[in-house]
Amino acid sequence: APVPPGEDSKDVAAPHRQPLTSSERIDKQIRYILDGISALRKETCNKSNMCESSKEALAENNLNLPKMAEKDGCFQSGFNEETCLVKIITGLLEFEVYLEYLQNRFESSEEQARAVQMSTKVLIQFLQKKAKNLDAITTPDPTTNASLLTKLQAQNQWLQDMTTHLILRSFKEFLQSSLRALRQM
């Protein structure tokens, strides 16, 4: 698995560099997670033909994966820093159950899947420090998450492959939109 941000050889070799700001740390953390997703997608795409399926075909699924919408304040039209930050944190918390599902879905990239999960937890902590309105953030219900996880794991092989692909793609898109909005803050 790749080394978490702040622990790569470049950082060790440059001890006199300015410490990263909170925004730079968040930016680097998201890019690190995106690299991890990219590696996981590679294994998924090599294993099945899900990646060839059209977006329209894949949209027909029962997964309630977090997605950015206009009302969330993360796009240029209607951009709202506080509303957007709440959406990003809420969305990441909602993704956690899906990242847990991914943990047993990879053979050669098992460590990478764990790294994505753990790095997301760290990212949530970074973002919570940045948010002023933590009361607006709703945490998913653990019981609901547990039953969702059981349901996902009980699917047949084809559906599990499809679910894995959809989670990775949706998580990537959510992170991309989040990072673009964070770069405006």
């Epitope: 890019r31 796009f75 991309q176 673009r180 770069r183 405006q184």
Partner: nanobody
Framework: EVQLVESGGGLVQPGGSLQLSCTTS????????VGWFRQGPGKEREFVAD????????WYAESVLGRFTISRDDAKNTVYLQMDSLKPEDTAVYYC?????????????????WGQGTQVTVSS
Amino acid sequence: EVQLVESGGGLVQPGGSLQLSCTTSGRRFSEYAVGWFRQGPGKEREFVADIGEQAENTWYAESVLGRFTISRDDAKNTVYLQMDSLKPEDTAVYYCAADKYGVGGNAQGYYDSWGQGTQVTVSS
């Protein structure tokens, strides 16, 4: 990194239109975010617009909002900048840049590949 080539620049009268293109032969260009920047005579290079891997995620500089439109055609490995209601102050060399993370942003440091630029002159 991807090799980027801009085209479509030229001389146009105030109020006129131009469409710039940013093309690459890179296989995975659809996964890149692409930004347009410009550098006017004696000025710093500045952000104009960008488009994410998800084409609906577009951002514009305040100075071009409502006049310029960024779009992408992944089948052609091309990103377009449609420039309408051009003003003399839009005169600049326009550069396109690519971000392998598919995110983009309004600062040059977010991009890892750059084109050579295309000249746009707005004058009567």
